[in-house]
Amino acid sequence: GDLLIQKTIKKQVVLEEGTIAFKNWVKTGTEVYRQFWIFDVQNPQEVMMNSSNIQVKQRGPYTYRVRFLAKENVTQDAEDNTVSFLQPNGAIFEPSLSVGTEADNFTVLNLAVAAASHIYQNQFVQMILNSLINKSKSSMFQVRTLRELLWGYRDPFLSLVPYPVTTTVGLFYPYNNTADGVYKVFNGKDNISKVAIIDTYKGKRNLSYWESHCDMINGTDAASFPPFVEKSQVLQFFSSDICRSIYAVFESDVNLKGIPVYRFVLPSKAFASPVENPDNYCFCTEKIISKNCTSYGVLDISKCKEGRPVYISLPHFLYASPDVSEPIDGLNPNEEEHRTYLDIEPITGFTLQFAKRLQVNLLVKPSEKIQVLKNLKRNYIVPILWLNETGTIGDEKANMFRSQVTGKIN
């Protein structure tokens, strides 16, 4: 009975050639889509001249098919029972699932101006930057197409920088023809309770972005977890998109295409300030923007983004402190639309449905030496876009799952 099923499950979730888990792990059988909503700035001049609140209007979804490429360089290591791989990146625009085309225009923060003025705070260098910004006719805001904003464009200001820097800028540049990793994960052969748990990422057990425990690479990549998941568990996973490990807790039982799954969600506590959640002290990396680590709901990942002042949050600043969203008008956070969840089949530990939601923001600060930032009276964490990456097990796969896994148990 149960022992036989357990034995079968343990055998089938091992990450090695011939198992059900391995086949779906190498190349996901689920169609994964990434939807983008861009925050179109409605009052660029007023912000630049008067330091007004930024009025944004979200436009989307613009949908791309992602994660359709098989893992590469899959290599088993029999000695330490691990398997290493690269996860290739690819995105294909899906016009039928989008409100417009990749050529649609948006008024957004000038990424290069905001980043350069933050990175180079030396007064003399800022004077150089100011002359280059003026010469290139750049401003605090810019109009860019969706394709440019996401995948890259040649920036006119950066093209004038007096030494060879990358002049191409884009929120996800470079993306196509790149890969995430190398990941090295436990294959579960010697210990099934470690299956899919990351041993190293890019050859290291920590990230070098954070202090203390915040820097650890914990858990899996969230595509699956070790089998026999309990509702009481805290599921740890690492997300390279947000340059950190995070966790999910059980919320409710869900029936997904006839398969009983556990819905795990990212709790608001994971985004809390160290005042409320002392464990988060090491995610507070500076004192000014974070108001002495009392602000919450935004994560400064600049160390992971070559010094560029990128802040990650939940969409519409869900679970963020009022001071973060106060200078931005037009945001409407709600849990149903904007939180992240994972629907996990508890016996196998497979994630059969998920919605990963996050928002990309950029910090822009006043600068007395840079004309286009001179009139700002405050710092802004400016929302650029939010994304919803979703995947759901297909009907055929669900039937197979019901007959081979849950059906046998029930």
Partner: antibody, heavy 115, light 108 residues
């Protein structure tokens, strides 16, 4: 105000080794590519080596004349850049400056290679 | 290696005179990556003009720079005594980074 202070120069015999250090202040050191440039009456200003940022995996470039003998490194936590020089030759003699090039230069430290 | 040749090696001018010094590159480079430094006797070099024509902070407006491709120049419209120094051109277009041999400006 930005400041760069080189140290470690002195007299060394041909074939010997020396390590130069440079401490920076007044700017966010970790955001700048750092260079060593030397100057001698015979050769004028001569670029020696460059080290980029952590985000560039601390990529380095060297002048052909020092490749394999000199190593540039940096410690962002100490706002410092170093130049380890091995198998020194008489033609390595000169004033060594550390600089992010577009900012100011240090006052330099003098290296003399002579027997 | 992109060799930068400066001429003249030494020049002499009276206060109020206009002077021009040149820097020739052995191969074409982007004007964005051609810079000039001023070095006074006993001092370290200072960035003077960046990206061919942009004056660094604190540089008097009598200085100007121009050029493209392989030919670049630094001009002082009306020389003053404090301009006595050696001026070096430098390229950041490719490795190795190279400096010119310098033009020494003497004031009569």
């Amino acid at each position: 105000e930005e400041k760069l202070e080189e140290s470690g120069g002195g007299l060394v015999q041909p074939g010997g080794s020396m390590k130069l250090s440079c401490v920076a202040s007044g700017f966010t050191f970790s955001n700048y590519w750092m260079n060593w440039v030397r100057q001698s009456p015979e050769k004028g200003l001569e670029w020696v080596a460059e080290i980029r940022l952590k985000s560039n995996n601390y990529a380095t470039h060297y002048a052909e004349s020092v490749k394999g003998r000199f190593t540039i490194s940096r410690d962002d936590s100490k706002s410092s850049v170093y130049l380890q020089m091995n198998n020194l030759r008489a033609e390595d003699t000169g004033i060594y400056y550390c600089t992010p090039l577009l900012l100011r230069w240090g006052q330099g430290t003098t290296l003399t290679v002579s027997s | 290696e992109n060799v930068l040749t400066q001429s003249p090696a030494i020049m002499s001018a009276s206060p109020g005179e206009k002077v021009t010094m040149t820097c020739r590159a052995s191969s074409s480079l982007s004007s964005t990556y051609l810079h000039w430094y001023q070095q006074k006797s006993g001092a370290s070099p200072k960035l003077w003009i960046y990206s061919t024509s942009n004056l660094a902070s604190g540089v008097p407006a009598r200085f100007s720079g121009s050029g493209s491709g392989t030919s670049y120049s630094l001009t002082i419209s009306s020389v003053e005594a404090e301009d006595a120094a050696t001026y070096y051109c430098q390229q950041y277009s490719g490795y190795p980074l190279t400096f010119g041999s310098g033009t020494k400006l003497e004031i009569k």
